[in-house]
Amino acid sequence: PPNRRTCVFFEAPGVRGSTKTLGELLDTGTELPRAIRCLYSRCCFGIWNLTQDRAQVEMQGCRDSDEPGCESLHCDPSPRAHPSPGSTLFTCSCGTDFCNANYSHLPPPGSPGTPGSQGPQAAPGESIWMAL
């Protein structure tokens, strides 16, 4: 259908770079969560930083193009990078409105499928773009 995709938009303080121009921020009448209407794709993304005790959202928004994973109805994150020892960045892509608001499931740190702790390390901020 020709309707444009609408996603949750969030960028944690201190994150370098922005995906704000990949869509049009909407006035939804509430301060949070913010919504963004995608310009160049029908695909939302989310990035969460999983540490031993909690998962913290880093970024949510629109992707710049449709690609594998965007056909998913729900946000099913996959491990992508290690910003620091003991933490893992998980990302998802999905193709329904607000599908990136939350993830369906995150594997526990160190479980099979999670990159080993000896994996590549990235400087804070750089790791977000590695994950994208």
Epitope: P2, N3, R4, T6, T21, E24, L26, D27, T28, G29, A35, R37, L39, Y40, S41, D64, S65
Partner: antibody
Framework: QLQLQESGPGLVKPSETLSLTCTVS?????????WNWIRQPPGKGLEWMGY???????SYNPSLKSRITISRDTSKNQFSLKLSSVTAADTAVYYC??????????WGQGTLVTVSS | DIVLTQSPGTLSVSPGERATLSCSAS??????????MHWYQQKPGQPPKLLIY???SLESGIPVRFSGSGSRTDFTLTISRVEAEDFAVYYC?????????FGGGTKLEIK
């Protein structure tokens, strides 16, 4: 100051391919936003044809999808339009324009392309 | 495709008068209460010029006598006091759905 300038043949024969280039100065086409082609038949309204985004994503008007190709040359900061199998109905002023989000804030001056044998 | 119908086709006003131009969409151009309708002015031999975006936001450098309003399917461009330089053709454009579409235009002429 951002400027866009269309160039290409002003006369194209029926059934041939119309080719136009838009040269952008004052802004990199790989920095942000989308780069569009819009046309206007003489004395008529405007028709959005398609865009190529800063990242290379492409979107076409379905009414033209089988005939249109938009591409870019990032080294020259240019983007181009090809429209195949043209007829007299494709006679128009062709504009290139930048879309800031989903509206058009910078336009070229336009170039008239006439389809005639 | 969303069809935009502008009325009247031609509007005759005297300088200093108020001008009201309408644009009606075949279906809503709103997303979660946000209207994706934009207005342009075009003079002979020139490209269109952006006046209003997202129904009511005035583009930088455009005189405040121009204003936009409306939601869903019905939108209005108002020129509070028409000046000589305002006589031109005005187009609305929607971007709520692909493909982007334009209205047929309203010609504002001197009465």
């Amino acid at each position: 100051q951002l400027q866009l300038q269309e160039s290409g043949p002003g006369l194209v024969k029926p059934s041939e391919t119309l080719s136009l280039t838009c040269t952008v100065s004052g802004y990199s086409i790989t920095s942000d936003y989308a780069w569009n082609w819009i046309r206007q038949p003489p004395g008529k309204g405007l028709e959005w044809m398609g865009y190529i985004s800063y990242s290379g994503s492409i979107s076409y008007n379905p009414s033209l999808k089988s005939r249109i190709t938009i591409s870019r040359d990032t080294s020259k900061n240019q983007f181009s339009l090809k429209l195949s199998s043209v007829t007299a109905a494709d006679t128009a002023v062709y504009y290139c324009a930048r879309s800031r989000y989903s509206w058009f804030d910078y336009w070229g001056q336009g170039t008239l392309v006439t389809v005639s044998s | 495709d969303i069809v935009l119908t502008q009325s009247p086709g031609t509007l005759s006003v005297s300088p200093g008068e108020r001008a009201t131009l309408s644009c009606s969409a075949s279906e809503s151009v709103d997303t979660y209460g946000n209207s994706f309708m934009h207005w342009y002015q075009q003079k002979p031999g020139q490209p269109p010029k952006l006046l209003i975006y997202r129904a009511s936001s005035l583009e930088s450098g455009i005189p405040v006598r121009f204003s936009g309003s409306g939601s869903r399917t019905d939108f209005t461009l108002t020129i509070s006091r028409v000046e000589a330089e305002d006589f031109a053709v005005y187009y609305c454009q929607q971007s709520n759905e692909d493909p982007y579409t334009f209205g047929g235009g309203t010609k504002l002429e001197i009465k």
